[in-house]
Interface confidence: medium
């Protein structure tokens, strides 16, 4: 499993270590999910083919994963913080059913998939407490994600094993343009 | 293996258009998290940093110079083309184009170098 | 704009000594950092990444310290092939590098 946050990953000395700031926190626990995904991907990669398919729409079509794009005010041009959060906020939220879903798809990694479950939880409260506007964030509909759940883990073996690379590929996306975004923030 | 080649003219009229293209190989502009970056060094100075275009188009400028530059990629042909508008002789540097890829955001892998000229 | 204030601008050291380089930024980049090397009329080199992590086939007398406003970088002996300059650069929002260390052999 991934180191939890404000430990380093790697062998180094941090004597004395200042607690955290409020952007450092996010900063180091985006990284965190990342690293989490990225051991996620590796047995994604190593069990099929999934990650060289040329096949990705056809599963494509059943997801509705969070994307970011120019209007969200995420991008350096038109960056605009307060829409950018909400996106960012929402978001997350709206992949919370998908990170459900991986939950029982994996065998060497099922603790890693429950740290990035549990971590994005964390990083969504870290979130909400920056948000000023959190009128504007819409919470999933829990019926609706009941239903979307229960479709998803009913397809097939090949559609589900490219559902998984699709989830983890896309979540990989959103948070590396949230992190950039945050850093401007 | 991981290469980029900067390729352009050697010498601009001031106040032309300066335009470069990065050519890469070994990885992929379409792969989430990759970015391809510009820095130029004036003889004897010190590294400027310009712009960087991320793989889902998103683009940052070095604020001092945001009017005159534009990045843009065709990830097809694994290129990435920066324009620099009102050229002038303190524009005159050897432009490098690099790699970032992921989140450590370290400029991992460097063209040699183009040498561009800006005289009349 | 964050800046990036590096020190010394050039130093002189014997082989085997120990050379320290200073960079310090004008607020807050946490561990977002990297260290270059540049040798005459060839591109930089990455060498150190997020503060302090060792690039891919770097030597490991090359190292990173600090988070942060204050980062240092070391080369534990200084060996003749490390005759170079020596930038930093920071990776929060939109990165500019510092001025710079020529490292010289006395």
């Known amino acids: 499993a991934p180191v939890p946050p404000g430990e380093d990953s790697k062998d180094v000395a941090a004597p004395h270590r200042q607690p955290l700031t409020s952007s450092e926190r996010i900063d180091k626990q985006i990284r965190y999910i990342l690293d989490g995904i990225s051991a996620l991907r590796k047995e994604t990669c190593n069990k099929s083919n999934m990650c060289e398919s040329s096949k990705e729409a056809l599963a494509e079509n059943n997801l509705n994963l969070p994307k970011m794009a120019e209007k969200d005010g995420c991008f350096q041009s038109g960056f605009n913080e307060e829409t950018c959060l909400v996106k960012i906020i929402t978001g997350l939220l709206e992949f919370e059913v998908y990170l459900e879903y991986l939950q029982n798809r994996f065998e060497s990694s099922e603790e890693q998939a429950r740290a990035v479950q549990m971590s994005t939880k964390v990083l969504i409260q870290f979130l909400q407490k920056k948000a000023k506007n959190l009128d504007a964030i819409t919470t999933p509909d829990p019926t609706t994600n009941a239903s979307l759940l229960t479709k998803l883990q009913a397809q097939n073996q090949w559609l589900q094993d490219m559902t998984t690379h699709l989830i983890l590929r896309s979540f990989k996306e959103f948070l590396q343009s949230s992190l950039r975004a945050l850093r401007q923030m | 293996q991981v290469t980029l080649r900067e390729s352009g003219p050697a010498l601009v009229r001031p106040t032309q258009t300066l335009t470069l293209t990065c050519t890469f190989s070994?990885?992929?502009?379409?792969?989430?998290?990759?970015?391809v970056g510009w820095i130029r060094q004036p003889p004897g100075e010190a590294l400027e940093w310009l712009a960087h275009?991320?793989?889902?188009?998103?683009?940052y400028y070095n604020p001092a110079l945001k009017g005159r530059l534009a990045v843009s990629k065709d990830t097809s042909k694994n290129q990435v083309v920066l324009s620099m508008n009102t050229v002038g002789p303190g524009d005159t540097a050897t432009y490098y184009c690099?790699?970032?890829?992921?989140?450590?955001?370290?400029?991992?892998?460097w063209g040699q170098g183009i040498l561009v000229t800006v005289s009349s | 704009d964050i800046q990036m204030t590096q020190s010394p601008s050039s130093l002189s050291a014997s082989v085997g000594d120990r050379v320290t380089i200073t960079c310090r930024a004008s607020?807050?980049?946490?561990?977002?950092l990297a260290w270059y090397q540049q040798k005459p009329g060839k591109a930089p080199k990455l060498l150190i990444y997020?503060?302090?992590y060792l690039a891919d086939g770097v030597p490991s007398r090359f190292s990173g310290s600090g988070s942060g406003t204050d980062f240092t970088f070391t080369i534990s002996s200084l060996q003749p092939e490390d005759i170079a300059t020596y930038y930093c650069?920071?990776?929060?929002?939109?990165?500019?590098f510092g001025q710079g260390t020529k490292v010289e052999i006395k």
């Open positions: 690099a790699r970032m890829e992921d989140y450590d955001e370290a400029m991992d892998y």
């Open positions: 070994g990885f992929s502009l379409s792969t989430s998290g990759m970015t």
């Open positions: 275009i991320w793989w889902n188009d998103d683009k």
């Open positions: 607020e807050n980049i946490y561990s977002n």
């Open positions: 997020a503060a302090t």
């Open positions: 650069q920071h990776f929060w929002g939109t990165p500019p």
